[in-house]
């Protein structure tokens, strides 16, 4: 959580982001919120990113402004225009592409005052596993499979019954390259595999960690799956 | 004895939504997954996805995604399954069944017409 | 997904016959195969689980077998009501898929 506060002139107003990270190829959010002004108009949200010469997004006098917004966001950006006013700045950005990723500020001018507040922004790719049994002669093994990381992940395997077992030696992990040529697909194979047992298969990488979970037993197996992004501090 | 009691037939016009209800006695309904299944006129089973009642966790097949819900009330033991823009296909006796499908309800009727 | 081929579709049958079903899927899936018994306004009932295991209060005349792609059940002698209709099911794979059915009818 970052929280910034303006300087000089004007009164100071308090603007707070969170860190986040934007999975490649779909829409991300960069979150900001500011103290609230009871005129639309006399709101000016901008935002920048370090490193790039136009704005972002600039929305002000209740609309969008986008007359100096850099090439590399055109078409991509829009601020929640019915929550400006609530206090929300914050900003979609469509089609996340990994050089999305950096340091961006976020500044908020009101009738109150001025502040700003930067965010870290991290781009990447994640995507919930899926664990199934298969069977090919005559032994099951388990395969845990997921679609989209980047940067490359690790995976780890654990099981309830052997806790704290290493399951490097009994398992095999393959990355396969996605037809976008950034993306990986995500294949690992554990073998030796015991019923009545519940195995976990945890994909992470600086951005996201992601587990699989499969409870078999005779009568059932039982799957879930959790991702959480790493990382998501305020500002 | 182990129950499961369904709500009864519903006849819905394309493009609206159904909520059938399944009503479970005799075991703890927290320590089961529920799964529902449907069954077209004259068709095979199919399965539409399943329930944990402790946490809500779910599982869908895709082919109802988005536009199956299921959702539990620990506090009356029942499980729910709406299906929201229905149309002709989607006729068909709708089942819930308990955990590793071993008993069912008696199925709920839901014709879709207009 | 699983496919899940059952045959025949319909057999005639006599009492005290033996009957045999079978249920092919399209890839391996170990033992995790049910099956169950469905009769016309009726509650659809397990019969046996993991490929072999007669779920409780099944009559033992009921029986199953095969491993990986290739299942059976067999009901030894047929009884009156027995005649309904079949489901095989796998649930190594989400989603869980079904066999078309056997309708067993009186010959």
């Known amino acids: 959580l970052i929280i910034g506060f303006g300087i000089s002139g004007r009164h100071s107003i308090t603007v707070t982001t969170v860190a986040s990270a934007g999975n490649i190829g779909e829409d991300g959010i960069l979150s900001c919120t500011f103290e609230p002004d009871i005129k639309l108009s006399d709101i000016v949200i901008q935002w920048l990113k370090e490193g790039v010469l136009g704005l972002v997004h600039e929305f002000k006098e209740g609309k969008d402004e986008l007359s100096e917004q850099d090439e590399m966001f055109r078409g991509r950006t829009a601020v929640f225009a019915d929550q400006v006013i609530v206090g929300n700045a914050s900003l979609r950005l469509k089609n996340v592409q990994l050089t999305d990723a950096g340091t961006y500020k976020c500044y908020i001018i009101t009738s109150k005052g001025k502040g700003n507040a930067n965010l870290e922004y991290k781009t990447g790719a994640f995507s919930m596993p899926e664990v199934n049994v298969d069977y090919n002669a005559s032994s099951e093994t388990l395969r845990c499979e997921a679609p989209r990381w980047f940067p490359q992940p690790t995976v780890v395997w654990a099981s309830q019954v052997d806790q704290g077992a290493n399951f490097s030696e009994v398992s095999n992990t393959s990355f396969e390259l996605n037809s976008e040529n950034v993306t990986m697909k995500v294949v690992s194979v554990l073998y030796n595999v015991t019923i009545n047992n519940t195995y976990s298969c945890m994909i992470e990488n600086d951005i996201a960690k992601a587990t699989g979970d499969i409870k078999v037993t005779e009568s059932e197996i039982k799957r879930r799956s959790h991702l959480q992004l790493l990382n998501s501090k305020a500002s | 004895e182990v129950q499961l009691v369904q709500s009864g037939a519903e006849v819905k016009k394309p493009g609206s939504s159904v909520k059938v209800s399944c009503k479970t006695s005799?075991?703890?309904?927290?320590?089961?997954?529920m799964h529902w299944v449907r069954q077209a006129p004259g068709q095979g089973l199919e399965w539409i996805g399943e329930i944990d009642p402790s946490d809500s966790y779910i599982n869908y097949n895709q082919k109802f995604k988005g536009r199956a819900t299921l959702t539990v009330d620990k506090s009356t033991s029942t499980a729910y399954m709406e299906l929201s823009s229905l149309r002709s296909e989607d006729t068909a006796v709708y089942y819930c069944a308990r955990g590793p499908r071993d008993y069912w309800g008696q199925g709920t009727t839901v014709t879709v017409s207009s | 997904d699983i496919q899940m081929t059952q045959s025949p579709s319909s057999l005639s049958a006599s009492v005290g016959d033996r009957v045999t079903i079978t249920c092919s899927a399209s890839q391996g899936i170990s033992n995790y195969l049910n099956w169950y018994q469905q009769k016309p306004g009726k509650a659809v009932k397990l019969l046996i689980y993991y490929t072999s295991r007669l779920h409780s209060g099944v009559p033992s005349r009921f029986s199953g077998s095969g491993s990986g792609t290739d299942f059976t059940l067999t009901i030894s002698s047929l009884q009156p009501e027995d005649f309904a209709t079949y489901y095989c099911q796998q649930y190594s794979k989400l989603p869980y898929t079904f066999g078309g059915g056997t309708k067993v009818e009186i010959k």
């Open positions: 005799g075991y703890t309904f927290t320590s089961y997954w």
